[in-house]
């Protein structure tokens, strides 16, 4: 579904320097869907259109990234650009729907982290070690503290998984790597199940 990424990039490259700056500021305050994290301000403000497109896609995936870009552009009064994205969204929506059939076959090829969400929530006990491995590189300070503030291991893991929808493959791989180091037998068990 690379079309969505290309469409976001086209839209952002059509913005003037001031408009791109305004887009970033609005992105810092726009209401996000439950479970999605915010791109860190420091990194965001330094990005050009290409970097920002990559960041939007890695944080929010293509579908929601496209929707979010449309929302911000509308907030800025740039209806025309938003409409162009709407067209792309509708076209790529049909492609996405076709690609997701049959669901059974794709479910098994999902990332380990997504496949075994329930088991990981139930069985990971050393959550602090996992959090430490993800601090900064995957989890912001606020996310890290929010997970650690939960009282039980299950609640901590549930909170951690609430951030997963905004993660890219690298982030999920980092979590898997941390789990392999801290709970090697659990990972082996789940991989064989």
């Amino acid at each position: 579904m690379g079309r969505a990424r290309d469409a976001i990039l086209d839209a952002l490259e059509n913005l003037s320097g001031d408009e791109l700056k305004k887009f970033k500021m609005k992105l810092l305050t726009v209401q996000l869907r439950e479970g999605y994290g915010r791109i860190p301000r420091g990194a965001l403000l330094q990005m050009d259109a290409i970097d920002l497109t990559d960041k939007l896609v890695s944080y929010y995936l293509e579908s929601y990234g496209l929707e979010l870009t449309m929302t911000v552009l509308r907030d800025m009064g740039l209806q025309e650009l938003a409409e162009q994205l709407q067209t792309t969204k509708e076209e790529s929506g049909a492609v996405a729907a076709a690609a997701s059939v049959p669901a059974q076959s794709t479910a098994r090829t999902g990332h380990f982290v997504d496949q075994h969400r329930q088991a990981l929530i139930a069985r990971v006990t050393e959550v602090d070690g996992v959090l430490d491995a993800l601090h900064g590189s995957v989890l912001t300070e606020g996310q890290y503290q929010a997970v650690r503030a939960e009282t039980t291991s299950q609640d901590k893991m549930r909170k951690l998984f609430s951030f997963v929808p905004s993660w890219n493959l690298t982030c999920k791989d980092s979590l898997l790597q941390a789990l392999k180091e801290i709970h090697p037998y659990l990972v082996m068990d789940l991989e064989q199940s």
Epitope: P40, G42, A43, V127, D128, D132, A133, S137, T140
Partner: antibody, heavy 118, light 111 residues
Framework: EVQLQQSGAELVRPGSSVKMSCKTS????????ITWVKQRPGQGLEWIGY????????EYNEKFKDKAALTSDTSSSTAYMQLTSLTSDDSTIYFC???????????WGQGTTLSVSS | DIVLTQSPASSAVSLGQRATISCRAS??????????MHWYQQKPGQPPKLLIK???TLESGVPARFSGSGSGTDFTLNIHPVEEEDTATYYC?????????FGGGTKLEIK
């Protein structure tokens, strides 16, 4: 062997800015964060802030938010700290260090001495 | 901010004896799994060197005469038996929350 090599001593005028560097080697730069620490002569250590160079994520000690700006260049495996609106109070030694798991600092640079004088 | 109070400020210990340095945090820096307290040694003209992380885990290459203990708010660094090369200033550091803070330091002298 992990090494952090900091730039040389700086002598600058009050009110000006300075950008010091911390060149790393011996490990994958983007897998770790870099933190910066201030130490006045004969005194303790003060945490300034950190940058996770893989994603540019930064956090600062509130005290240094308007003083320090942390950046990095992955192509040269180098972290930078820019200090602005310099005063004599900024004259001291600054260390960079690598952030290990648990946010302890396992490898340190040799320090950069900053002198602010008119 | 969490304040770390080290004691004593300075200490003179005879060669071969035990040196004990204390670090007290103004609030707990421990979970059920880990204590986010670390210890460093700094010699004059040199950067600090990590000795112990997570309150009690000895860093690779650090002699076994160094040990750390404690949880919650009270932590201790022990050196036994002390050697001449242990003359230095020792700092504790927490990484529980921002801002990360260091203790005021303990200057250790070997008699």
């Amino acid at each position: 062997e992990v090494q952090l090599q900091q730039s040389g001593a700086e002598l600058v005028r009050p009110g000006s800015s300075v950008k010091m560097s911390c060149k790393t080697s011996g490990y994958t730069f983007t897998n770790y964060g870099i933190t910066w620490v201030k130490q006045r002569p004969g005194q303790g250590l003060e945490w300034i802030g950190y940058i996770y160079v893989g994603n540019g994520y930064t956090e600062y000690n509130e005290k240094f938010k308007d003083k320090a700006a942390l950046t990095s260049d992955t192509s040269s495996s180098t972290a930078y700290m820019q200090l602005t609106s310099l005063t004599s109070d900024d004259s001291t030694i600054y260390f960079c260090a690598r952030i290990a798991q648990g946010r302890c600092f396992d490898y340190w640079g040799q320090g950069t001495t900053l002198s602010v004088s008119s | 901010d969490i304040v770390l109070t080290q004691s004593p400020a300075s200490s003179a210990v005879s060669l071969g004896q035990r040196a004990t340095i204390s670090c007290r945090a103004s609030q707990s820096v421990s979970t059920s799994s880990y204590s986010y307290m670390h210890w460093y040694q700094q010699k004059p003209g040199q950067p600090p060197k990590l000795l112990i992380k997570y309150a009690s885990t000895l860093e690779s290459g650090v002699p076994a005469r160094f040990s750390g203990s404690g949880s919650g708010t009270d932590f201790t660094l022990n050196i036994h038996p002390v050697e001449e090369e242990d003359t230095a200033t020792y700092y504790c550091q927490h990484s529980w929350e921002l801002p990360y803070m260091f203790g005021g330091g303990t200057k250790l002298e070997i008699k």
